[in-house]
């Protein structure tokens, strides 16, 4: 069965099956390089 990609909070459909958070937070550290 089809899974709908995680959509942001104002979208009508949302599921975590995409493996991505609905509204990912900004990383708080910066990788070297």
């Amino acid at each position: 069965s089809e899974t709908t990609t995680g959509t942001s909070s104002n979208s009508s459909q949302s599921t975590s099956n995409s493996g991505l958070a609905p509204n990912p937070t900004n990383a708080t550290t910066k990788a070297a390089g």
Epitope: E2, S8, S18, T25, N26, A27
Partner: antibody, heavy 115, light 112 residues
Framework: EVRLEESGGGFVQPGGSMKLSCVAS????????MNWVRQSPERGLAWVAQ??????????RYVESVKGRFTISRDDSESTVYLQMNNLRAEDTGIYYC??????WGQGTTLTVSS | DVVMTQTPLTLSLTIGQPASISCKSS???????????LNWLLQRPGQSPKRLIY???NMDSGVPDRFTGSGSGTDFTLKISRVEAEDLGIYYC?????????FGGGTKLEIK
């Protein structure tokens, strides 16, 4: 069966431009965020860009290294996502995969940036 | 960016042996909805990546039950109870909690 098919890769000189396309089938395309991921021997897998839904006003996100150079767009009527790449650099070389998230991946299209 | 560190770099095993791959993130991957967006992918030689596991431990359809994912916060593990020939390739962890999404460097599973 979900299929994502990329095209548009090739050879380009530094500073040049290229436009990649990805046609999706087997899914309700307008309901899916779409992403481009790059793979290179030097840098491994790296997420490049994302475009969200019409209901999100087609919001886009980019990794810092491509901001101002790459533009992701989509045509829901054609179930297609695009990646317009300008001012290309050698480090942009790699296989570009179209993905819905982490779940579905295309076969990839190769871009080589070299003089 | 969130750094994803995978160990070991290479696993060289015989058919039937167990395998364990570690993935550590530089920040917690627990999202505000209570879910942890940690995924495992397998890239077989000459192929594109294929997802095995999402949300730490949820297996995708068609994935053999010899694969299990576990962990929380910053420390995650992929285990294969008994390695089979079709398992060879490079395993990647990837986080979808923080922007930009980031991948581990990969663990190559070789069959002796």
């Amino acid at each position: 069966e979900v299929r994502l098919e990329e095209s548009g890769g090739g050879f380009v000189q530094p500073g040049g431009s290229m436009k990649l396309s990805c046609v999706a089938s087997g899914l309700t395309f307008p309901n899916h965020w779409m992403n481009w991921v790059r793979q290179s021997p030097e840098r491994g897998l790296a997420w490049v860009a994302q475009i969200q839904l019409k209901s999100d006003n087609y919001a886009t996100r980019y990794v810092e290294s491509v901001k101002g150079r790459f533009t992701i767009s989509r045509d829901d009527s054609e179930s297609t996502v695009y990646l317009q790449m300008n001012n290309l650099r050698a480090e942009d070389t790699g296989i570009y995969y179209c993905t819905t998230g982490t779940d579905y991946w295309g076969q990839g299209t190769t871009l080589t940036v070299s003089s | 960016d969130v750094v994803m560190t995978q160990t070991p770099l290479t696993l060289s095993l015989t058919i039937g042996q167990p395998a364990s791959i570690s993935c550590k993130s530089s920040q917690s991957l627990l999202y505000s909805d209570g879910k942890t967006y940690l995924n495992w992918l397998l890239q077989r030689p000459g192929q594109s990546p294929k997802r095995l596991i999402y949300l730490v431990s949820n297996m995708d359809s068609g994935v053999p039950d010899r694969f299990t994912g576990s962990g929380s916060g910053t420390d995650f593990t992929l285990k294969i109870s008994r390695v089979e020939a079709e398992d060879l390739g490079i395993y990647y962890c990837v986080q979808g909690t923080h922007f930009p999404y980031t991948f581990g460097g990969g663990t190559k599973l070789e069959i002796k």
